[in-house]
């Protein structure tokens, strides 16, 4: 019961956080204008991974999508890729956990398929997870970068009289999401592995017994050819699942002075 | 046609205190942010205040902050100006503009007098 | 605050001339977000409310003649009439749209010699 409970869990708080990471992916604000220097500013910007926006205080909205690839940032296209294959593989996760959810019946599949299942879900939920938080952070990184850069250069004197005031971009709304939403994936895949621990069965160890027979010595194990097999119809084999250690190779990010749009 | 008509104009008291309105027709006054603009006796424009759509966002020249009061009655299709603590310098005619893209402002009321003098 | 400061402040004109008024902001108009500049001219004809002419320093508003024109970037503007009419001999104002309080302009008045 409390497996069921724990996997059904697991499911839930994967599929919500999975959602969470596609909205943050999509979302316009994963940088807001800093209104530090101009809190009644009547423009404000907010930038997304795919397009950039310009909200008028008269209520106009302007998005201008980033039509270039070759021209954007490399550390955007990172934090693109990361989030999509965050996706991908959180998608990719929900099915597989669909199908190995013990209160979910489908054909004759043994506890064993539901275990290795459930594993593999987790597993791919606790990546798709620190994909999502990795990208966050890389751009969060960038705009704490873009930031500083452009406090230090906030005013430049035209003349001596004139300013012109660049602008700063700060953490927005969709940064959040995404964390929350990561590491929401990632609880939900470490309760997916642990619920599979409880899913395994564990294999009865039957000590070989010898039975002497008068006039033969012959020894044997019950189950015979069936059981080291494992071809018999009531026979459960006990799997050995290895994680396995992931390794990605570190990019290294240079601070721009400019901002992506 | 989109009109705005101004009202609640006169003379007023030094110290004393005047509402102004704005009745919005051949629109949909919800969807716009609206602003008060004023213009001395042969002076230029001067701003006042603004007012979003939904009344969430407010803003007022220094000038006027704590002194004057901008609101809207959607369903009734109406923007005020409460005008409080009068100065001589507040004499002006009043106007009330519908803002549109670009921050700019399309249409203005005909606008309404205010004196204060005693 | 911006400040806008418009020159001249009045104008001796002549029908069918090409007139050129400047309007200066203390601060850069130009927003990075989408590159516009966030300038607004008005028409103010004597007893009547201001009448907008141009917004994002250079898109006309539908209805405005095309021999009105709005140029400049970042704190220089100016608006071009290409052939002055009877009618365009009045008042315009340039107004900050970028950030509050929205600021206007003194003025520039046009008159016929």
């Known amino acids: 019961m409390a497996v069921t409970a724990c996997q059904g869990l697991g499911f839930v708080v994967s599929l919500i956080g999975i959602a969470g990471i596609i909205a943050a992916t999509c979302m316009d604000q994963w940088s807001t204008q800093d209104l530090y220097n101009n809190p009644v500013t009547a423009v404000f910007n907010y930038q997304g991974l795919w397009r950039s926006c310009v909200r008028e205080s008269s209520g106009f909205t302007e998005c201008r999508g980033y039509f270039t690839l070759l021209g954007l940032p490399a550390m955007l296209q990172a934090v693109r890729a990361l989030m999509i294959v965050g996706i991908v593989l959180g998608a990719i996760g929900l099915l597989v956990s669909i199908f190995a959810l013990k209160c979910i019946r489908i054909g004759s599949m043994e506890d064993s398929a539901k275990a290795n299942m459930t594993l593999t879900s987790g597993i791919m939920f606790i990546v798709s997870g620190l994909c999502a938080i990795a990208g966050v952070s890389v751009f969060a990184n960038m705009l704490v970068t873009n930031f500083w850069m452009s406090t230090a250069n906030m005013y430049t004197g035209m003349g001596g009289m004139v300013q012109t005031v660049q602008t700063r971009y700060t953490f927005g709304a969709a940064l959040f999401v995404g964390w929350v939403a990561g590491g929401l994936t990632l609880i939900g895949g470490v309760m997916m592995c642990i619920a599979c621990r409880g899913l395994a069965p564990e294999e009865t160890n039957y000590k070989a017994v010898s039975y002497h027979a008068s006039g033969h010595s012959v020894a044997y194990k019950p189950g015979g050819f069936k059981a080291s097999t494992g071809f018999g119809s009531n026979t459960k084999n006990k799997k050995i699942y290895d994680g396995g250690a992931r390794t990605e190779d570190e990019v290294q990010s240079y601070p721009s002075k400019h901002d992506y749009v | 046609e989109v009109q705005l008509v101004n009202s609640g104009g006169g003379l007023v008291k030094p110290g004393g205190s005047r509402k102004l309105s704005c009745a919005a027709s051949g629109f949909t006054f919800s969807d716009y942010g609206m602003h008060w603009v004023r213009q001395a006796p042969e002076k230029g424009l001067e701003w006042v205040a603004y007012?979003?759509?939904?009344?969430?966002?407010?803003y007022y020249a220094d000038t006027m902050k704590g002194r004057f009061t901008i609101s809207r009655d959607n369903a009734k299709n109406t923007l005020f100006l409460q005008m409080t603590s009068l100065r001589s310098e507040d004499t002006a005619m009043y106007y009330c503009?519908?803002?549109?893209?670009?921050?700019?402002?399309?249409?203005w009321g005909q606008g309404t007098s205010v004196t204060v003098s005693s | 605050d911006i400040v806008m400061t418009q020159s001249p402040s009045s104008l001796t004109v002549t029908a069918g001339e090409k007139v050129t008024m400047s309007c200066k902001s203390s601060q850069s108009l130009l927003n990075s977000g989408n590159q516009k500049n966030y300038l607004t001219w008005y028409q103010q004809k004597p007893g009547q409310p201001p009448k907008l002419l141009i917004y994002w320093a250079s898109t006309r508003e539908s209805g405005v003649p095309d021999r009105f024109t709005g140029s400049g970037s970042g704190t220089d503007f100016t608006l071009t009439i290409s052939s002055v009419q009877a009618e365009d001999l009045t008042v315009y104002y340039c107004?900050?749209?970028?950030?509050?309080?929205?600021?206007f302009g003194a003025g520039t008045k046009l008159e016929l010699k």
């Open positions: 503009a519908r803002f549109v893209r670009g921050n700019s402002m399309d249409y």
């Open positions: 107004q900050n749209a970028y950030s509050y309080p929205l600021t």
């Open positions: 007012i979003s759509s939904g009344s969430s966002t407010i």
